[in-house]
């Protein structure tokens, strides 16, 4: 069981721990330079009790 | 504002059933799970069981399995848990709760006295 | 089942100390996979539900004041309130949702 892909975010990069986002994998966003990154810049894949896997939170945003 | 609002209170006599309904507004409701707490008066908190509004599989303390049934209305985002077989000790302060590793938002809770 | 077994049952503490509450489980709550601890604190003041103050055992929910504070992994956990004041006065209870979700039986904190 895995999680879905979160996405990219506008004008960001992001490192992926892993191609498939098993549980325990890994996305961090890094904001284009000049943008300021507003939520969580790090998501981790975790299971639920009752519900597939989800990340821990939503995809942030790079604002100006 | 995210809100669960949940039914009146209930009086049952010992033996009946009670079904008790949680609405959800302020969040998309099959984004999280719903679960259900119980406090008895002056007791601690425990944890009854929950369910996935996206898919509709549940989870339950086997203290209660058999006994309770958690349903869902992904139209009216509205939770249901329903307790039979009902004895004086389920008398307590029955809670919905938002939550798939923690519970952020908590209904104002639903007292249900069981007395013949 | 995990269980969750928290320490005191019961604390007063003057106005503007530390408090401290501690809290075990009977197995650890460190997921290798996904390096948290599936561990919770919730603060209940009377005739309210439970509000929840920590996840992750050490991170703060939005809006909780910064005098509280969570600390410990796999088996052994605490809750710090550094500063003490009036409305702090409540039942802490520790959970966990490692498997499932259990509770520990609460921690009544009262004004010395």
């Known amino acids: 069981t895995s999680c879905h892909d979160p996405g990219d975010v506008e004008h960001s990069r992001r490192l992926i721990s892993s191609p498939k986002f098993p549980v325990g994998a890994t996305v961090q966003y890094i904001c284009d330079q000049g943008f300021v990154l507003m939520g969580s810049s790090i998501l981790t894949c975790h299971d639920r009790q009752a519900g597939s896997p989800k990340w821990s939170d939503r995809a942030p945003k790079c604002l100006l | 504002q995210v809100q669960l609002v949940q039914s009146g209170a209930e009086v049952k006599k010992p033996g009946a059933s009670v079904k008790v309904s949680c609405k959800a507004s302020?969040?998309?409701?099959?984004?999280?799970?719903m679960h259900w707490v119980r406090q008895a008066p002056g007791q601690g908190l425990e944890w009854m069981g929950g369910?996935?509004?996206?898919?509709?599989?549940?989870v339950y303390n086997q203290k209660f399995k058999g006994r309770v049934t958690l349903t869902e209305d992904t139209s009216t985002s509205t939770a249901y848990m329903e307790l039979r077989s009902l004895r004086s000790e389920d008398t307590a302060v029955y809670y919905c709760?938002?939550?798939?590793?923690?519970?952020?938002?908590w209904g104002q809770g639903t007292t249900v006295t069981v007395s013949s | 089942d995990i269980v969750m077994t928290q320490s005191p049952d019961s604390l007063a503490v003057s106005l503007g100390e530390r408090a401290t509450i501690n809290c075990k489980s009977s197995?650890?709550?460190?997921?290798?996979?996904?390096?948290?601890?599936?561990l919770a604190w919730y603060q209940q003041k009377p005739g309210q539900p439970p509000k929840l103050l920590i996840y992750?055992?050490?991170t703060r929910e939005s809006g909780v004041p910064d005098r509280f504070s969570g600390s410990g992994s796999g088996t052994d956990f605490t809750l710090t309130i550094s500063s003490l004041q009036a409305e702090d006065v409540a039942v802490y209870y520790c959970?966990?949702?490692?498997?499932?979700?259990?509770f520990g039986q609460g921690t009544k904190l009262e004004i010395k």
């Open positions: 709760t938002r939550g798939d590793w923690y519970f952020d938002v």
């Open positions: 992750w055992a050490s």
């Open positions: 369910i996935d509004p996206e898919s509709d599989n549940t």
């Open positions: 197995q650890s709550l460190l997921n290798s996979r996904t390096r948290e601890n599936y």
């Open positions: 959970g966990q949702s490692y498997n499932l979700f259990t």
């Open positions: 302020g969040y998309t409701f099959t984004d999280y799970e």
